[in-house]
Interface confidence: low
C-alpha cells in the first residue's frame, strides 16, 4: 500500500485491547483545506517502540488503515480512499511490545468536520441570577457550535460543564459562580450537530473573582500632627491577597480585588465636601480633625464588605496662637495666617458637650493682613460663644476647600466665652493665720480653670490699710493658695484675688479684711 493512501487490508498485528489505562486517546479529525484533512491524537504511556495505525471503516463496510509510525498526527487528501462526504468511523490502534491498545471511536462526516477555534479575544463576564454569564464574539465563519467549559478553584481540579448549543454571531454560557473563591474557566467549541467532530483547543484562561470580594483585613496608624497641621495616615497591614487558581497567577485580568479608601471628615461640617474616595495605595495626609475611614473592597461584580475605623481628632492644643478681642461692636479672632487666598473653617463647641453638633463657620478665601494675621469676626447679636462657659475652638485651613485631603489644622485651643473677666473671678476667698507674721490665703478655683490653657495666672493683692501700701503676688494657675509673709501684728489688711487670661485682666474678688492679733506675753 502507498503511504499516502488508506490501505484496505488488515493491519500487521493482532487484535486491539481497549481495557488499558494507557494508550491512544482524544482522537480528532477535521478538514484543514478544501481537499485536505488531518487527524491527531494523544498517546498516554512510554512512547519508545510504539507504532500507530489510524483505522477507518466506511459506510459500505469496507475498512482500511494508515500506518503513521511514531507520529501522532496524519494529513491526507480526499483522494486517499476515505470517503469524505459520507459518515465514517475512525479510531487509533497503537502497537508496542506485542500488545495493541485502542482509542475510543469517532464517527463523522469529514467534509463537514471543520476544526473549530476556541472563543478568541475578549470574553465578557457578568453576573446573572446568581450565576456567571460569559459572552464572546463567534469566530469568523463558525456560527453553530456546541460549547463546553471547564473550571477549577485554587484547591480543586478541573470540572467539566456544558454551555449547550450556540447559533448566533455572539455565543454565551451560564456557569456556576463561587461565593468565596476565585475560579479559572476555559472554553472550547465544536461544530453543532456533529457529535463525532473534534473539539477546539481550550481558550485562554478566564479568571473570575468570587462573588463576594474578601473582607479587607487592614490596619492603620496615624502619625503625629506635623508643624504644617497635617498628619499622615499609614497602612500598617496590607489586605490579604486572594488565592488564585494556577492559570490565573501572574497578571491575570478580571480576578483583581481593588481596595478603596473612603474618608469622611467629621469636623467642620459646613465645608463643601465631607467625603472623598481614593485608591488604597494613595495614603492621604489628614488634618487634626476627627475622621471615619472605610476600606471598601470591590471586584468586577461590584463592591463587597467594608471595614470602618474612627480616627479621633488630634487633641494637642496651642494656648497662645489665638487672639480674641471683644469690643462694643462684637468679637474678632486673630491667628497666624496661612498662604494667600486661604479658606478657614472655624469650629467651636462647649466643653463637655462633645456629642452635640459643633458650630461651624466657613470664611471666604482671605489673604493675610499687614501683620500676617487672619481674622474672623462676629457681632454680639449673633450670640456666638456668648455664654459664660468654656469652648473648644479649632481652626482648619485649605487653599482648595473642596479637596478633602488638603485641609490642615491651624490651631486647636480653648476660649472662655461671655464676660470672662467677671465669670472668672475667684470666690470663697479665706484667710487663715499661718505664723506670727504670715497668713495663708485660699480660694475656690476660677471657672476659667475648667478651660485648658485659658487661665494664665492668679494675682493676689494685699493692701496695708494703715499705710495704703499694696503688694501683688502672682500664683500659678494650678494653685489656689498662697502664703503672705512679713505682715505686722495689729495692722488691718485687705486681700483680693483675680484670675487673668493671656489677653484679659480679671475682676478682683470682694475684699477680705484680716489682721494678725498682737501676742501678749504673760
Amino acid at each position: 500500500c502507498r503511504t499516502s493512501e488508506c490501505c484496505f487490508q488488515d493491519p500487521p498485528y493482532s487484535d486491539a485491547d481497549s481495557g488499558s489505562a494507557s494508550g491512544p486517546r482524544d482522537l480528532s479529525c477535521y478538514r484543514i483545506s478544501s481537499a485536505g484533512y488531518e487527524c491527531s491524537w494523544q498517546y498516554e504511556g512510554p512512547t519508545a517502540g510504539v507504532s500507530h495505525f489510524l483505522r477507518c471503516c466506511l459506510s459500505s463496510g469496507r475498512c482500511c488503515y494508515f500506518a503513521t509510525g511514531s507520529a501522532t498526527r496524519l494529513q491526507f487528501s480526499d483522494q486517499a480512499g476515505v470517503s469524505v462526504l459520507h459518515t465514517v468511523t475512525l479510531w487509533v490502534e497503537s502497537w508496542a511490545r506485542n500488545r495493541t491498545e485502542k482509542s475510543p471511536e469517532v464517527t463523522l462526516q469529514l467534509y463537514k468536520s471543520v476544526k473549530y477555534k476556541p472563543p478568541l479575544g475578549d470574553i465578557k463576564v457578568s453576573k446573572l441570577a446568581g450565576q456567571l454569564r460569559m459572552e464572546w464574539e463567534t469566530p469568523d465563519n463558525q456560527v453553530g457550535a456546541e460549547v463546553q467549559f471547564r473550571h477549577r478553584t485554587p484547591s480543586s481540579s478541573w470540572k467539566l460543564g456544558d454551555c449547550g448549543p450556540q447559533d448566533d454571531d455572539t455565543e454565551s454560557c451560564l456557569c456556576p459562580l463561587e461565593m468565596n473563591v476565585a475560579q479559572e474557566f476555559q472554553l472550547r467549541r465544536r461544530r453543532l450537530g456533529s457529535q463525532g467532530s473534534s473539539w477546539s483547543k481550550w481558550s485562554s484562561p478566564v479568571c473570575v473573582p468570587p462573588e463576594n470580594p474578601p473582607q479587607p483585613q487592614v490596619r492603620f496608624s496615624v502619625e503625629q500632627l506635623g508643624r504644617d497641621g497635617r498628619r499622615r495616615l499609614t497602612l500598617k497591614e496590607q489586605p490579604t491577597q486572594l488565592e488564585l487558581p494556577e492559570g490565573c497567577q501572574g497578571p491575570a485580568p478580571g480576578v483583581e480585588v481593588t481596595y478603596q479608601l473612603q474618608l469622611h471628615m467629621l469636623s467642620c461640617p459646613c465645608k463643601a465636601k465631607a467625603t472623598r474616595t481614593l485608591p488604597l495605595e494613595k495614603m492621604p495626609y489628614l488634618s487634626g480633625a476627627a475622621y471615619n475611614v472605610a476600606v471598601i473592597s470591590s471586584n468586577r461584580f461590584g463592591p463587597g464588605p467594608n471595614q470602618t475605623w474612627h480616627i479621633p481628632a488630634d487633641t494637642h492644643t496651642e494656648p497662645v496662637a489665638l487672639n480674641i478681642s471683644v469690643g462694643t461692636n462684637g468679637t474678632t479672632m486673630y491667628w497666624p495666617a496661612r498662604a494667600q487666598s486661604t479658606t478657614y473653617c472655624i469650629e467651636w463647641q462647649p466643653v463637655g458637650q462633645e456629642g452635640s453638633l459643633a458650630t461651624c463657620n466657613l470664611t471666604a478665601p482671605q489673604d493675610p493682613d499687614p501683620a500676617g494675621m487672619a481674622t474672623y469676626s462676629w457681632s454680639r447679636e449673633s450670640g456666638a460663644m456668648g455664654q459664660e462657659k468654656c469652648y473648644h475652638i479649632t481652626i482648619f485651613a485649605s487653599a482648595h476647600p473642596k479637596k478633602l485631603t488638603l485641609w490642615s489644622t491651624v490651631l486647636s485651643t480653648y476660649h472662655f466665652g461671655g464676660n470672662a473677666s467677671a465669670a472668672g473671678t475667684p470666690h470663697h476667698v479665706s484667710v487663715k493665720n499661718h505664723s506670727l507674721d504670715s497668713v495663708s490665703v485660699d480660694w475656690a478655683p476660677s471657672l476659667l480653670s475648667t478651660c485648658p490653657g485659658v487661665l494664665k495666672e492668679y494675682v493676689v493683692r494685699c493692701r496695708d490699710e494703715d499705710s495704703n501700701q499694696v503688694s501683688e503676688h502672682p500664683v500659678q494657675p494650678t494653685e489656689t493658695q498662697v502664703t503672705l509673709s512679713d505682715l505686722r501684728a495689729g495692722v488691718a489688711y485687705t486681700v483680693q484675688v483675680r484670675a487673668d487670661t493671656a489677653w484679659l485682666r480679671g475682676a478682683w474678688s470682694q475684699p477680705q479684711r484680716f489682721s494678725i492679733k498682737v501676742q501678749v506675753s504673760d
Partner: nanobody, 114 residues
C-alpha cells in the same frame, strides 16, 4: 411563538417526591439545551439543573445533586425534573428555561412542609 408551560407542582411533606414537567412549543426543542431554575419567597432566581439538546449531558447545582434528576423526551417536546428527598428549603416557584435565549414559563409552585 416559543412557549413553555410548567406543571406538577404542589404541597408535599419533607422527604417526599414530585415530578415537574415542562411542555415546549414554538421552537425546535431537540436543538436546544434546557434548564430548571427556582425562586424561593423573597429571594432571587437560582439555577438548579441543565440538560443538553440530546440529553447526553446533565448538570446540577450542588445542593440538589443525588436528589434531583433532569431528563427530556425530544419526541414529545417535554422536559422533566424528578425531585426526591425534598426539604423545606426546596420550597419555591420552579421555572423551565430555554438555555440559549433565557425565555421561561409562568412557573409551578412547590411547597415542602409538614
Amino acid at each position: 411563538q416559543l412557549q413553555l408551560v410548567e406543571s406538577g407542582g404542589g404541597l408535599v411533606q419533607p422527604g417526599g417526591s414530585l415530578r415537574l414537567s415542562c411542555a415546549a412549543s414554538g421552537f425546535t426543542f431537540s436543538s436546544y439545551g434546557m434548564s430548571w431554575v427556582r425562586q424561593a419567597p423573597g429571594k432571587g432566581l437560582e439555577w438548579v439543573s441543565y440538560i443538553s439538546a440530546g440529553g447526553g449531558t446533565t448538570t446540577y447545582v450542588d445542593f440538589v445533586k443525588g436528589r434531583f434528576t433532569i431528563s427530556r423526551d425530544n419526541a414529545k417536546n417535554m422536559l422533566y425534573l424528578q425531585m426526591n428527598s425534598l426539604k423545606p428549603e426546596d420550597t419555591a416557584v420552579y421555572y423551565c428555561v430555554h438555555a440559549a435565549d433565557g425565555s421561561r414559563g409562568q412557573g409551578t409552585q412547590v411547597t415542602v412542609s409538614s
